[in-house]
Interface confidence: low
């Protein structure tokens, strides 16, 4: 039975041209985490498994860097970053876990961040 | 539909080499693991190399380290096992097969249908 | 030989329930959930059950995997016809990073 609840940054938002942390917590599970993959819509943006430890996609290598922890940074932050991210736990034994991020780019120098929130 | 198609497969002399392809469709090729596995004539399955999401981490099973070359093209959405030194010990169905995970092992959830290779004089 | 041991056959009637058993050691199974395959002669080997007990979507819930310690079983409850295939257990080797599979057990339905 997956007891497990994934706490994540929630709804959040930066400036275009500046930078933005995505994280995920895993918490009320003993369940060991295997890997963890951070994706957008259907595309892969990095992965930080267990053994191997981080990789990030070709395609992402530039803007993107890993950390801290288990999350992610963003760079150089565009318009078109604007969007849903997930952070997918693999986890043994209780298998997946989904935690889902929603970034907005703004052109304006406003910019806050949401409240944090739990997917179970 | 997500699907794998295995071609190259045929007759080849021991000692000669041979290039496998898998045709992938129906989902995003360049965001998962690929796997090789074969099955000799009446015996079970054998795992043969894997290759990370991105080409760049790769392992091999004992029997076919050194002779054999696990690549894949994202662009072109296809899987390679480059066959080197063929031995008769060598003729099975091979097939390419997806993992869930990118980057390590978690399971292979689709399966082509396999091509076969058989190593003979 | 395989590094995962399975017992070469198993069976059954219709409606009964089997067990499948997978033994390996502390650097595979000790670490790694186990994955089941199904093999219908003629056709390409199919997920049963993967990270230890999930099953994919379109499994029937009369399968069921479990695992302890450094060995794993696949149950069949209310065993049907279209049963009778050959099972492999697999699971990755973190020492050796190698994927290592069971020889297999054929499961005939009587």
């Known amino acids: 039975m997956m007891t497990g609840t994934i706490e994540t940054t929630g709804n959040i938002s930066a400036e275009k041209g500046g930078s933005i942390i995505l994280q995920c917590h895993l918490s009320s599970t003993t369940a060991q985490v295997t890997q963890v993959n951070w994706e957008q819509q259907d595309q892969l943006l990095a992965i930080c498994n267990a053994d191997l430890g981080w990789h990030i996609s070709p395609s992402f290598k530039d803007r993107v860097a890993p950390g801290p922890g288990l999350g992610l940074t963003l760079q150089s932050l565009t318009v078109n970053d604007t969007g849903e991210y997930f952070c997918i736990y693999h986890t043994y034994p209780d298998g997946t876990y989904t935690g889902r991020i929603f970034l907005e780019v703004l052109e304006s120098s406003v910019a806050e961040h949401g409240a944090r929130f739990q997917i179970p | 539909e997500v699907q794998l198609v295995e071609t190259g497969g045929g007759l080849i002399q021991p000692g000669r080499s041979l290039r496998l392809s898998c045709a992938a469709s129906g989902f995003t090729f360049s965001s998962y693991a690929m796997h090789w596995v074969r099955q000799a004539p009446g015996k079970g399955l054998e795992w043969v190399a894997v290759?990370?999401?991105?080409?760049?981490?790769?392992y091999y099973a004992d029997s076919v380290k050194g002779r054999f070359t696990i690549s894949r093209d994202n662009s072109k959405n296809t899987l390679y096992l480059q066959m080197n030194s063929l031995r008769a010990e060598d003729t099975a169905v091979y097939y390419c097969?997806?993992?869930?995970?990118?980057?390590?092992?978690?399971?292979?959830?689709?399966w082509g249908q396999g091509t076969t290779v058989t190593v003979s004089s | 030989q395989s590094a995962l041991t399975q017992p070469r056959s198993a069976s059954g009637n219709p409606g009964q329930r089997v067990t499948i058993s997978c033994s390996g050691s502390s650097s595979n199974m000790g670490r790694r959930p186990v994955n089941w395959y199904q093999q219908i002669p003629g056709t390409a080997p199919k997920l049963l059950i993967y990270s230890q007990n999930q099953r994919p979507s379109g499994v029937p819930d009369r399968f069921s995997g479990s695992q302890s310690g450094t060995s794993a079983s696949l149950t069949i409850s209310g065993l049907q016809s279209e049963d009778e295939a050959e099972y492999f257990c697999?699971?990755?080797?973190?020492?050796?990073?190698?994927?290592?599979l069971g020889g297999g057990t054929q499961l005939a339905v009587l």
């Open positions: 097969a997806r993992d869930p995970l990118p980057l390590h092992y978690y399971g292979m959830d689709v």
């Open positions: 290759i990370s999401y991105a080409g760049e981490v790769k």
């Open positions: 697999a699971v990755w080797d973190d020492i050796g990073r190698v994927l290592q």
